[in-house]
C-alpha cells in the first residue's frame, strides 16, 4: 500500500512530469451539457393573474470542449490558468433542434421591472415608455440557439444606457453566451508539489481570496477545488467542495454511498438538502438571502441584479410551494439530483452529473403595464446537466494503473 | 370595442391655455402608459410627453417642459394635456396614444384634436 | 424639425413597388427598433411595422420592413390605391428620452 500511495502521490499532483498532468490540462472526459427549457403553455393568461403552466422540452444536447491556457507555475507552490469552453449541437443526442421556438418569460422586461419596484417613478415612465415604444412583451417567442448563445434585443441597448456598467452584455442577451469561448475567470490553485494536503485546493480566483456578492464572510469564502479533481485519499467522511463561478459561490456535497464504476471504485457525492436551503432553515446559509422560500437561492447580486434563482430541477428539495405554484413541475429524486462519482484513492472524477435550475422571479410591478396582472412567482426557465464519463483508452489506463497493478503488485 | 375619445377643435389667443382630454371607452386608462403627440399643419408627429396614470407620474419632452401638464383621473378614465402661454406655432392636431395590444408600440390612437392658435 | 429624417414624397404606379427611407443616428435607429405608421388624410396615425419588420395582424403582407446601422426602411410592393397616405418612422431615442417620429413621406399612386 506504501508503494502505491507513494506512487498516487508522484502522479496526482499538477506538475508537467506526472501522470495525471496532462489529463489535468485537457480533460479528456467527454462532457455535455444537456439543456430542458420550460415552455410556457399559457402566457396570457399568467398576464391576466393565472398560475403559470409549463412543459419541459428537450434535451438539447451539447458537446463540451474544454481547455486550459495561460498555464502559470508560481513560485508559492500554485498554478494559475484560465479555462475555456467552447459548446457544439449534437443533433443525434438531442430531443429536437436548435431552430426549435420555445415561449419564455422576457428576461430582460420581467428581469427590469422587478428591478426598477422601488426605483424613482420618472425612471419607471421612461422605461415603461421604452418598453411600449420597441414593442416589447412579458414572454417572448424564441429559438433554442437564440435564447442559448444570444438575440438582438434593442433592450440591452436601454439596459446599458440606463443603468450603465451593470449589464455585461452589448447588443445580444444569451443565458449561456457569456460560456462559450469563453474562460471562468483566473484560477489559481495548489500543484500539491510541496504540499499534497492542498492539492487543487483555490487559492484564488480572479485574484481574490474571498468575493463580495453576499452578506457573510462565510458565503463569500471561495473554498475547495475548481471543481474537477480533488485531494486523493478520501473516506467517506470527506466532502466534495468547489468554487463554482457560475452560481458566483462555493459548493459543498455530502458522501453518500461507496459504488464501481466500470471496475473502479468509486464514492458518490451528493448535494445536501441544505445547499439551497434559506437561512431560517440553515442559518450558515443567511449570508446569501434575502431569501424567498427555501430550497432556491438568489443569485441577482451576482446576475446583472436580474431577480434570477438558481435551484434543483423542478426545485427537488424544495419548499413544495415552489412546485405547487407551476403547473408541470414533477420533482424526482433520479432524475433531478446532482452526483459526483469520485475515484477516492486519487480524487478523481469517474462519472458525474451537476443538475441545476435557473428561474426567474416575477411579478405584476405598477406603473409598468407589460407586466399586466402577473401574481408573484418563481418561473423555471430552464434546467442543465453537464455530465461526463470516463471511458475509452483513459478508463483502460486508469483501471491498469490503478486497480490492476495494485492487485498484481498486492500478490 | 376600446376607443380613445378626445375633446372637439378648439380656437384660442395667443397667450392662453388649452386643455384637451382623452377619455378611454370600454378600458381602463391606469394599466399602461399614454402619450401625447401632436401634429403641426404638413409636419411630422412630435412626440409631448407621457404619463402612467396610475401613479401620475409624467414625463415631458424637453421642448415643453413647463409648458406643458399632463394629468390622468382614473376614476373616469380620462387624460388630459394642457399647454399653456400658446402661440401660433402650437397650432395642431393634439393626439392621445396607448398600447392595447401587448407588444404592439402605441396601437391605438385618438382621433386627434385641432387646436388652432390665431388672434 | 424631426430627429428622424424621411424623404418628403414617394410615387409609383399600382403594382409597384416603392422604398420609404427614414434616417437617424446613434440615439436612436443604429440602438433601436423601428416601427411604421400610416395616415391616411384627416385619420390618426395607424401602427402598420413593429420592431423593425413585424406586421400587426391585419396588414397586408405587402408591406415589409427593414433597419440596418442609423437608417430604416418601409417597402411596399404591388402598390394599391388605397396605399395613398402619409408614413412615418418612429423609435426610441436616447436623447429625448422618449419616443421620436420622422417628418413623415407622402405617397402617392400614380
Known amino acids: 500500500p506504501s508503494l502505491i500511495k507513494q506512487q498516487v502521490l508522484k502522479n496526482v499532483r499538477i506538475d508537467p512530469s506526472s501522470l495525471s498532468f496532462n489529463m489535468w490540462k485537457e480533460i479528456p472526459i467527454p462532457f455535455y451539457l444537456s439543456v430542458y427549457f420550460f415552455d410556457v403553455m399559457n402566457p396570457s393568461e399568467i398576464l391576466k393573474g393565472e398560475k403559470p403552466q409549463v412543459r419541459e422540452r428537450g434535451p438539447y444536447v451539447y458537446r463540451e470542449f474544454r481547455h486550459k491556457s495561460n498555464i502559470t507555475f508560481n513560485n508559492n507552490d500554485t498554478v494559475s490558468f484560465l479555462e475555456y469552453r467552447t459548446f457544439q449541437f449534437q443533433p443525434s443526442k438531442s430531443h429536437g433542434s436548435e431552430s426549435d421556438y420555445i415561449v419564455m418569460p422576457n428576461i430582460l422586461v420581467l428581469g427590469a421591472a422587478v428591478m426598477m419596484e422601488n426605483k424613482p417613478m420618472t425612471l419607471k415612465l421612461i422605461m415603461t415608455l421604452a418598453f411600449t415604444t420597441l414593442g416589447e412583451r412579458a414572454f417572448m417567442n424564441r429559438t433554442v440557439g437564440e435564447i442559448m448563445w444570444g438575440y438582438k434585443d434593442p433592450l440591452v441597448n436601454l439596459i446599458n444606457k440606463y443603468f450603465p456598467g451593470m449589464f455585461p452584455f452589448k447588443d445580444k442577451f444569451g443565458l449561456f453566451a457569456e460560456l462559450n469561448n469563453s474562460d471562468s475567470g483566473l484560477f489559481t490553485v495548489f500543484t500539491g508539489v510541496q504540499n499534497i494536503s492542498r492539492i487543487h485546493l483555490v487559492d484564488k480566483w480572479n485574484g481574490l481570496s474571498k468575493v463580495d456578492f453576499w452578506h457573510s464572510d462565510q458565503c463569500n469564502m471561495i473554498n475547495g477545488t475548481s471543481g474537477q479533481m480533488w485531494p486523493p485519499f478520501m473516506t467517506p467522511e470527506s466532502s466534495l467542495e468547489f468554487y463554482s463561478p457560475e452560481a458566483c459561490r462555493s459548493m459543498k456535497l455530502m458522501y453518500k454511498e461507496s459504488g464501481v464504476f466500470e471496475g473502479i471504485p468509486t464514492y458518490r457525492f451528493v448535494a445536501p438538502k441544505t445547499l439551497f436551503a434559506n437561512g431560517s432553515i440553515y442559518p450558515p446559509n443567511e449570508g446569501f438571502c434575502p431569501c424567498l422560500e427555501s430550497g432556491i437561492q438568489n443569485v441577482s447580486t451576482c446576475r446583472f441584479s436580474a431577480p434570477l434563482f438558481l435551484s434543483h430541477p423542478h426545485f427537488l428539495n424544495a419548499d413544495p410551494v415552489l412546485a405547487e405554484a407551476v403547473t408541470g413541475l414533477h420533482p424526482n429524486q433520479e432524475a433531478h439530483s446532482l452526483f459526483l462519482d469520485i475515484h477516492p484513492v486519487t480524487g478523481i472524477p469517474m462519472n458525474c452529473s451537476v443538475k441545476l435550475q435557473l428561474s426567474l422571479y416575477m411579478k405584476s410591478v405598477a406603473g409598468i403595464g407589460q407586466t399586466g396582472k402577473i401574481e408573484p412567482v418563481v418561473l423555471p426557465l430552464l434546467w442543465f446537466a453537464e455530465s461526463g464519463a470516463m471511458e475509452g483508452e483513459t478508463l483502460h489506463t486508469f483501471y491498469t494503473q490503478l486497480v490492476l497493478m495494485p492487485k498484481v503488485m498486492h500478490y | 370595442e376600446v376607443q380613445l375619445v378626445e375633446t372637439g377643435a378648439e380656437v384660442k389667443k395667443p397667450g392662453s391655455s388649452v386643455k384637451v382630454s382623452c377619455k378611454a371607452s370600454?378600458?381602463?386608462?391606469?394599466?399602461?402608459?399614454i402619450i401625447w403627440v401632436r401634429q403641426a399643419p404638413g409636419q411630422g408627429l412630435e412626440w409631448m410627453g407621457g404619463i402612467i396614470p396610475i401613479f401620475r407620474t409624467v414625463n415631458y419632452a424637453q421642448k415643453f417642459q413647463g409648458r406643458v401638464t399632463i394629468t390622468a383621473d382614473d376614476s373616469t378614465s380620462t387624460a388630459y394635456m394642457e399647454l399653456n402661454d400658446l402661440r401660433s406655432e402650437d397650432t395642431a392636431v393634439y393626439y392621445c396614444?396607448?398600447?392595447?395590444?401587448?407588444?404592439?408600440?402605441?396601437?391605438?390612437w385618438g382621433q386627434g384634436t385641432l387646436v388652432t392658435v390665431s388672434s | 424639425q424631426s430627429v428622424l429624417t424621411q424623404p418628403p414624397g414617394a410615387s409609383g404606379a399600382p403594382g409597384q413597388r416603392v422604398t420609404i427611407s427614414c434616417s437617424g443616428d446613434s440615439s436612436n435607429i443604429e440602438s433601436y427598433a423601428v416601427n411604421w405608421y400610416q395616415q391616411v388624410p384627416g385619420m390618426a396615425p395607424k401602427l402598420l411595422i413593429y420592431r423593425d419588420n413585424q406586421r400587426p395582424s391585419g396588414v397586408p403582407d405587402r408591406f415589409s420592413g427593414s433597419r440596418s446601422g442609423t437608417s430604416a426602411s418601409l417597402a411596399i410592393s404591388g402598390l394599391q390605391s388605397e396605399d395613398e397616405a402619409d408614413y412615418y418612422c418612429?423609435?426610441?431615442?436616447?436623447?429625448?428620452?422618449?419616443?421620436?417620429f420622422g417628418g413623415g413621406t407622402k405617397v402617392t399612386v400614380l
Open positions: 370600454g378600458d381602463t386608462l391606469s394599466s399602461h402608459a
Open positions: 418612429g423609435s426610441w431615442d436616447d436623447n429625448l428620452n422618449g419616443p421620436t
Open positions: 396614444a396607448k398600447t392595447l395590444n401587448e407588444g404592439l408600440p402605441w396601437d391605438y
